[in-house]
């Protein structure tokens, strides 16, 4: 905290303007108004203040606001937002999807970086968190904005909280988002993407909702092998094992088209390895890849998970 | 990649008035400030002052701000300083620079520099 | 304005031994500290920050250290292409002031 010191004469500042760049932290302290400064907070991220002023900064807007910001003075806090901590952010009430977009540029990095930080800072979560909290549920508008600056922004949360996007915002998100989403999260996420899309043509429908797959099950598989859709490699590695390991031989034939043939590189990793072991030999043979590991011609398989529903 | 480029070298007589360029490339020019220092023979660094090309806004280091003017021209991603009532203390080689962060005045990228010579 | 003074002015160094110069300020400036590596003909490139954060791509060999008042820059082994003059910057407050330099040779 910086100690009340005297502001010198001819010092006082009667408007936020450069010439404050060149104040000393308890120059900052005694000479700049809080008033002042909420009101001309536009100003401040138009001047070059270092790290070290903003502390002064923020110190006096905490005494004038201790129960937390308006949303006028945060919607203009620019480089200011980047001393908040989660426990000052926990204290607003952000509405505005401009406001929400403006601390998200601010905090974008300022670095020249192609590459968008994978999951949110702290204070970026407790932000985008309070924010949606207060609209209720993720509509298109906040997830276009969230994925744009965050691409692994929906991986980051949990299926609880994935249940509140409705099947709208779906037509948002891109592949890119869905990257580090686990299998839970795409349990959630497919049936909303499988009732967005659902009037879409067959090779359109494939396109949009190819990387929400992991969630799909096995009959939905079954369904796109009769569509000859072309799946590559990549996405049906991706998918559930459990989803996978019904299929006959020819239905993943089917799904996968001329791609069949990456199978053989795969043979050893899930699914493809787990749903081998499940398929017979001689069927697996048809498929001229000497995938191998099936199960041998003359044996009889039981399923003893059904033999047990039904017990 | 971001690139300064400035001008060429200078050969001027004292009392005379010049004008620097610093072309940038590869970001976005008007999204951070455009800093100026500079380095006299043997000698270490100097701030000069800054533009935000976005805004024109700019500040200078107190005993630069009579002489010295620091400008942009958007439509050709470039900034200017214009140097006056040049003395034999102004050879220097000037540099263009710019911050990325600017809570965190670091010179993150530099120009070649331009060396400007006073002398009658 | 804050006054940032370097120490030696020169220093030479053996071939993989240890370098050290030092950075002092006239004012506690906290962390806001870079160092910067300037070669002959050549504009200074960022090394440190935060006295203590390396540049990405900078090898590891160059480590900083310090807070408040007083700051290190430790080269751990010395390389040929390591011969250059250094320079500590303070950004704690404006005008950014920069000290004299150090300039690193071999032994």
């Known amino acids: 905290e910086v100690e009340k010191t005297a502001c010198p004469s001819g010092k006082k500042a009667r408007e936020i303007d450069e010439s404050l760049i060149f104040y000393k932290k308890w120059e900052l302290e005694a000479c700049v108004d809080a008033a002042l400064l909420a009101t001309q907070m536009d100003r401040v991220n138009a001047i070059p203040f270092t790290y070290e002023q903003l502390d002064v900064l923020k110190h006096k807007l905490d005494e004038l606001y201790p129960q937390g910001y308006p949303e006028s003075v945060i919607q203009h806090l620019g480089y200011l937002f980047l001393k908040m901590s989660p426990e000052d952010i926990r204290k607003w009430n952000v509405t505005s999807l401009e406001t929400l977009k403006a601390l998200l540029e601010v905090n974008k990095g300022h670095e020249m970086s192609p590459q968008a930080p994978r999951r949110p800072l702290p204070q970026v979560a407790t932000l985008i968190d309070r924010f949606v909290k207060g609209r209720g549920q993720l509509d298109k508008d906040t997830l276009d904005t969230l994925t744009a600056f965050y691409p692994g922004y929906l991986c980051s949360l949990s299926p609880e909280e994935l249940s509140s996007v409705p099947p709208s915002s779906i037509w948002a998100v891109r592949p890119q988002d869905l990257d580090t989403c686990d299998p839970r999260q795409l349990d959630v996420l497919y049936p909303k993407a499988r009732l967005a899309f659902q009037n879409m043509n067959g090779s359109e429908y494939f396109v949009k909702i190819q990387s929400f797959l992991g969630g799909a099950p096995t009959e939905d598989l079954k369904a796109l092998s009769q569509q000859n859709v072309s799946m590559d490699l990549a996405t049906f590695m991706k998918l559930r094992t459990d989803a996978v390991l019904p299929l006959t031989v020819a239905e993943v034939q089917k799904l996968l088209g001329p791609h069949v043939e990456g199978l053989k590189a795969e043979e050893r990793h899930r699914p493809v390895r787990d749903w081998i072991l499940r398929q017979r030999q001689d069927d697996l043979d048809t498929l001229g890849l000497g995938l191998q590991g099936g199960i041998p011609n003359g044996y009889l398989v039981l399923d003893l998970s059904m033999q047990e529903a039904l017990s | 990649q971001v690139q300064l480029q400035q001008s060429g070298a200078e050969l001027v007589k004292p009392g005379a008035s010049l004008k620097l360029s610093c072309k940038a490339s590869?970001?976005?020019?008007?999204?951070?400030?455009m800093h100026w220092v500079r380095q006299a023979p043997g000698q270490g660094l100097e701030w000069i002052g800054a533009?935000?090309?976005?805004?024109?806004?700019?500040i200078y280091y107190q005993k630069f701000k009579s002489r010295f003017t620091i400008t942009v021209d958007k439509s050709t991603s470039t900034a200017y300083m214009q140097l006056s009532s040049l003395t034999s203390e102004d050879t220097a080689v000037y540099y263009c620079?710019?911050?990325?962060?600017?809570?965190?005045?670091?010179?993150?990228?530099w120009g070649q520099g331009t060396t400007v010579t006073v002398s009658s | 304005d804050i006054v940032m003074t370097q120490s030696p002015d020169s220093l030479a160094v053996s071939l993989g031994e240890r370098a050290t110069i030092t950075c002092k300020s006239s004012?506690?400036?906290?962390?806001?500290l870079a160092w910067y590596q300037q070669k002959p003909g050549q504009p200074p490139k960022l090394l440190i920050y935060?006295?203590?954060t390396r540049e990405s791509g900078v090898p590891d060999r160059f480590s900083g250290s310090g807070s408040g008042t007083d700051f290190t820059l430790t080269i751990s082994s010395l390389q040929a292409e390591d011969v250059a003059v250094y320079y500590c910057?303070?950004?704690?407050?404006?005008?950014?002031?920069f000290g004299q330099g150090t300039k690193l040779e071999i032994k």
């Open positions: 620079a710019i911050i990325i962060t600017p809570v965190v005045p670091k010179f993150d990228y």
């Open positions: 590869g970001y976005t020019f008007t999204s951070y400030w």
């Open positions: 533009i935000h090309p976005n805004s024109d806004n700019t």
């Open positions: 004012h506690d400036v906290g962390t806001s």
């Open positions: 935060w006295a203590s």
């Open positions: 910057q303070q950004y704690s407050s404006y005008p950014l002031t």
